[in-house]
């Protein structure tokens, strides 16, 4: 049965051009056998497919071998257009990106998209952030009731293009000051101009709370 | 007529060496490729391994460590070591032969030998 | 390793009826795929190659169909000389492997 297969098949072998570099050929079926080397791809135009033997395999496809079996497999990563092997790719689909192999919609943390090739490069290395430094204003650690308190971390490894920009290495926040008052009583300009202004709003208020009290009683022994 | 004949011990003791020969008839062994296929008591088929028309060899990674195959192209034959065989060896061992992707694969089989792995 | 399993595991089914027998992959294994026959006491004889390619000699109530990991083979009108045991193989991969057979008796 099979050996019907296999001798019908050499017959037409020579003047075919899709028969190159087959050691069996069918003008229905293609090439079934491939010279040693080149690689077996199964090409398919609608309902119909027929084998080919190649040199190397076409986009989409990689060539995967066995000891003396070449054949072209298809790409079967996720979003990738070419890859090397089963489960490295090599080009992503447009709009993804290349990372090891593999294919992102975005990249990875700790990774920065490379527009120009699509592809997920180094991106800045920023160390831990440190301890909240201690509360303070105008360089003074009292003296206020708010102040600001600042936090920093280092870059351990810039990024391979100086076009990704490093996250932020300081950042601030608001806070209260443990010590309102300084130690020794002395208050800044500020602080003596706001307790002169309260003295002199306590007086008004005082005056004008007598002067209130004057005309109600004059109007009373009246 | 391409024809496979398998040969060999029907009874091998547990921990000793299986060793069978195909012997081919039809086409030579030095085109395509020259498989061993086994078939369980349960009726599952397991492929163990090939070896091509240039000599070499592909085995399952569950046997690599204790299969081998060979061939004597002189003799138009081909063999089967399996080492350190257990009752689990227990079946019955074809050879078989396909010849690339584009054509059939195993399209000739021996009649298969039963091979009984027990002490 | 590449998973093929196939369904039903048994059927009964009577002269003249259409049957289909199913193998599933674990993965897409691109057409790569063969239906054998297996009588009792006799060796496996290969039906169809590369999903749907019929063997000379093999009666064209034989099909085969599918793509991805679902394929399926067809006799159209089952003869008493169709009964044995089918299995399905995928030979997208090394190591290649065979589904677990579909033991066919007529009714």
């Known amino acids: 049965q099979g050996n019907r297969w296999r001798r019908s098949k050499r017959a037409s072998y020579v003047s075919n051009p899709i028969c190159k570099g087959c050691l069996s050929c069918s003008k229905d079926n293609g090439c079934s056998r491939c010279q040693q080397k080149l690689f077996f791809f199964l090409r398919r135009e609608g309902m119909r497919q027929y084998g080919e033997c190649l040199h190397s395999c076409p986009s989409g496809y990689y060539g995967h071998r066995a000891p003396d079996m070449n054949r072209c497999a298809r790409c079967r990563i996720e979003n990738c257009d070419s890859c090397f092997s089963k489960d490295f790719c090599t080009k992503c689909k447009v709009g993804f990106y290349l990372h090891r192999g593999r294919c992102f919609d975005e990249c990875p943390d700790g990774f920065a998209p490379l527009e120009e090739t699509m592809e997920c490069v180094e991106g800045c290395e920023v160390g831990h952030w440190s301890e909240w430094g201690t509360c303070s204003r105008n360089n003074r650690t009292c003296g206020f009731k708010w102040g600001l308190e600042t936090r920093t971390r280092q870059i351990v490894k810039k990024p391979v293009k100086d076009t990704i920009l490093c996250p932020t290495i300081a950042e601030s926040r608001r806070c209260k000051m443990t010590m309102r008052h300084c130690p020794g009583g002395k208050r800044t300009p500020k602080a003596k101009e706001k307790r002169n202004k309260k003295k002199k709003r306590k007086l008004i208020e005082r005056a004008q709370e007598q002067h209130s009290v004057f005309l109600a009683t004059d109007r009373a022994n009246q | 007529e391409v024809q496979l004949q398998e040969s060999g011990p029907s009874l091998v003791k547990p921990s000793q060496t299986l060793s069978l020969t195909c012997s081919v008839t039809?086409?030579?062994?030095?085109?395509?490729?020259w498989s061993w296929i086994r078939k369980f008591p349960g009726n599952k088929l397991e492929f163990m391994g090939y070896?091509?028309?240039?000599?070499?060899?592909y085995y399952i990674p569950s046997l690599k460590s204790r299969v081998s195959i060979t061939r004597d192209t002189s003799k138009n034959q081909y063999y089967l070591q399996l080492n350190s065989v257990t009752t689990e060896d227990t079946a019955t061992y074809y050879c078989?032969?396909?010849?690339?992707?584009?054509?059939?694969?195993?399209?000739?089989w021996g009649q298969g030998t039963l091979v009984t792995v027990s002490s | 390793d590449i998973k093929m399993t196939q369904s039903p595991s048994s059927m009964y089914a009577s002269l003249g009826e259409r049957v289909t027998i199913t193998c599933k992959a674990s993965?897409?294994?691109?057409?790569?795929l063969s239906w054998f026959q297996q009588k009792p006491g006799k060796s496996p004889k290969t039906l169809i190659y590369?999903?749907?390619r019929l063997i000379d000699g093999v009666p064209s109530r034989f099909s085969g169909s599918g793509s991805g990991q679902d394929y399926s083979l067809t006799i159209n009108s089952l003869e008493y000389e169709d009964m044995g045991i089918y299995y399905c193989?995928?030979?997208?991969?090394?190591?290649?492997?065979f589904g677990a057979g579909t033991r066919l008796e007529i009714k």
């Open positions: 078989a032969t396909y010849h690339g992707y584009g054509g059939p694969w195993f399209a000739y």
């Open positions: 039809g086409d030579s062994i030095t085109s395509g490729y």
């Open positions: 070896i091509s028309f240039s000599g070499k060899t």
């Open positions: 993965q897409d294994i691109d057409s790569y």
């Open positions: 590369l999903t749907n």
């Open positions: 193989l995928q030979y997208d991969e090394f190591p290649v492997t």
